[in-house]
């Protein structure tokens, strides 16, 4: 007997050949004998079965002795074991109808877990392994769970059941709703602007909800909350904004905001949460502003930095076009006595330079 | 989505083969029960179906065309190919590669863009 | 072979106007063994109906089929300016697969 998988909601073709390729009588039927669909003179007639609105057949492949049935808008109980009657003979083909649906919405927040459920029909034992876009394989019986859905979970999945030695594929699309970084950081020059940007990994046709920047300054002993937004439709509106520091924010996405001045005080961290309308739980971004300064006082040239830097970062002072250079893994290095000329203070991970400020010393008399 | 594109010459020899070569993108073609068919259109004339391979590599050919024709398929490189033997001035046509699925069954959902070939010496 | 006979060859109106195409088939193709295709200057024809009356994907609702048996008519209900195409039927009751030889609706 012939097995032949198909997909809840699908259409399945169900073949039938005759040993001479030219019209004949034919009809399907079910197990129970009851009448789907045959041939009667060149029409197509349909009997009383429960499939008859959804069973047809190719037509115009009659005269070449094949006659199918195809069936649309599939369903589990669909499943059952098909015969077809021609030129005195019954072929059996037997058809296994299967679901495979996400528990929940499918658009779910980062950390959140994603539940596949199998739909079967009764006395199968169908096994599914799915694939993330990833790469990720998990596999499972009638359910099939991804704990802490991840960033690079968002795309289509592609899960494969497989019974009898025969497999149906099927494709879920899965959005795991977060902001493409986890985390980033800003380097700037005491006085320059600050932009910070907070890009969506995802697209939503509307996207409403609230979010909220917390920051908490490297000088501060609490955090405390510098912005608040309303997001509608895409459309950003301010609900309210600290005196100090003095936030912009564009009315677009991607969620973008603006401090008029690096100063020392403001260096620090923060995180930005999203709260989504109809989902439970925020998404997060964190940011980090590392302001640079550069100062020369009375007979000492300074060179410091605020902000959370990594104690394998490298802040130096070098004299341009000279050999003078004072390099320490610290946040503050310093020069006494500096020689006259162009000295720059530069920040820099492995050779790779992150920040510099440049401060001329111009000599004494 | 799938899309379809057609290859070939532009320009064959009266009494030579024609090979055409229809390469589908976006879909596996053996993933669904889809039929993959040939359809040309004569200059400023209507259209005429040519054949098709089904998703289990059954070939269906029309009478008119059946003893110049063949149809396969290369299921590793995602194509289905035509063949027309002893072509006259008559095959001059743009060829179109197209597809059915079994929810739409033998009226061609999706078409490639065509190529124009002249028989011609 | 079933032969489809389209008419009229040139359907002449203006935007906002009902089209009504006609395709009539040599022997009966069955109840719903017939599609309808659009066509425009140097595009691949694309699917609007199936199943004499079932809308292709994506196509607007002003496109509708009717009709079974020999008689099956296309209307679109408010020409657009994009509409103004060579429009084929094609059946499917019997091999070989034939297409009508099209009817011309064009800006009056």
């Known amino acids: 007997k012939k097995v032949v998988l198909g997909k809840k909601g699908d259409t399945v073709e169900l073949t039938c050949n005759a040993s001479q390729k030219k019209n004949t009588q034919f009809h399907w039927k079910n197990s129970n004998q009851i009448k789907i669909l045959g041939i009667q003179g060149l029409f197509l007639t349909k009997g009383p079965s429960k499939l008859s609105d959804r069973a047809d057949s190719r037509k115009s492949l009659w005269d070449q002795g094949c006659f199918s049935m195809i069936i649309k808008n599939l369903k589990i109980e669909d499943s059952d074991t098909y015969i077809c009657e021609v030129e005195n003979k019954k072929e059996e083909v037997e058809l296994l109808v299967f679901g495979l649906t996400a528990n929940s919405d499918t658009h779910l927040l980062e950390g959140q877990s994603l539940t596949l459920t199998l739909e079967s029909p009764p006395g199968s034992s169908p096994s599914v392994k799915c694939r993330s876009p990833g790469g990720k394989n998990i596999q499972g019986g009638r359910t099939i769970s991804v704990p802490q859905l991840e960033r690079q979970d968002s795309g289509t999945w592609t899960c494969t059941v497989s019974q009898d030695q025969k497999t149906v594929e099927f494709k879920i699309d899965i959005v795991v709703l977060a902001f493409q970084k986890a985390s980033s950081t800003v380097y700037k020059k005491e006085g320059e602007q600050v932009e910070f940007s907070f890009p969506l990994a995802f697209t939503l046709e509307k996207l409403t909800g609230s979010g909220e920047l917390w920051w908490q300054a490297e000088r501060a002993s609490s955090s405390k909350s510098w912005i608040t937004f309303d997001l509608k439709n895409k459309e950003v509106s301010v609900k309210r904004v600290t005196q100090d520091p003095k936030l912009q924010m564009g009315k677009k996405l991607p969620l973008h905001l603006t401090l008029p001045q690096a100063l020392p005080q403001y260096a620090g961290s923060g995180n930005l949460t999203l709260a989504l309308e109809a989902k439970t739980g925020k998404l997060h971004q964190e940011v980090n502003l590392v302001v640079m300064r550069a100062t020369q006082f009375q007979e000492n040239l300074t060179c410091e930095v605020w902000g959370p830097t990594s104690p394998k970062l490298t802040l130096s002072l070098k004299l341009e076009n000279k050999g003078a250079t004072v390099s320490k893994q610290a946040k503050a290095v310093w020069v006494l006595n500096p020689e006259a000329g162009m000295w720059q203070c530069l920040l820099s991970d492995s050779g790779q330079v992150l920040l510099e400020s440049n401060i001329k010393v111009v000599p004494t008399w | 989505q799938v899309q379809l594109q057609e290859s070939g010459p532009g320009l064959v020899k009266p009494s030579q083969t024609l090979s055409l070569t229809c390469t589908v993108s976006?879909?596996?073609?053996?993933?669904?029960?889809?039929?993959w068919s040939w359809i040309r259109q004569h200059p400023g004339k209507g259209l005429e179906w040519i054949g098709y391979?089904?998703?289990?590599?059954?070939?269906y050919y029309n009478p008119s065309l059946k003893s110049r024709l063949t149809i396969s398929v290369n299921t590793s490189k995602n194509q289905f190919s035509l063949k027309l033997s002893s072509l006259t001035a008559a095959d001059t046509a743009v060829y179109y590669c197209?597809?059915?699925?079994?929810?739409?069954?033998?009226?061609?959902?999706?078409w490639g863009q065509g190529t124009m070939v002249t028989v011609s010496s | 072979e079933i032969v489809l006979t389209q008419s009229p060859g040139t359907l002449s109106l203006s935007p906002g106007e009902r089209a009504t195409l006609s395709c009539r088939a040599s022997?009966?193709?069955?109840?719903?063994?017939l599609a309808w295709y659009q066509q425009k200057p140097g595009q691949a024809p694309r699917l609007l109906i199936y199943?004499?009356?079932s809308r292709a994907t994506g196509i607007p609702d002003r496109f509708s089929g009717s009709g079974s048996g020999t008689d099956f008519t296309l209307t679109i209900s408010r020409l657009e300016p994009e509409d103004f195409a060579v429009y084929y039927c094609?059946?499917?009751?019997?091999?070989?697969?034939?297409f009508g030889p099209g009817t011309k609706v064009d800006i009056k």
């Open positions: 197209a597809r059915d699925r079994p929810s739409n069954f033998d009226a061609f959902d999706i």
């Open positions: 976006g879909d596996s073609i053996s993933s669904g029960y889809y039929y």
């Open positions: 391979i089904s998703y289990s590599g059954s070939t």
């Open positions: 022997q009966s193709v069955g109840s719903t063994y």
């Open positions: 199943g004499a009356f």
């Open positions: 094609q059946q499917y009751g019997s091999s070989p697969l034939t």
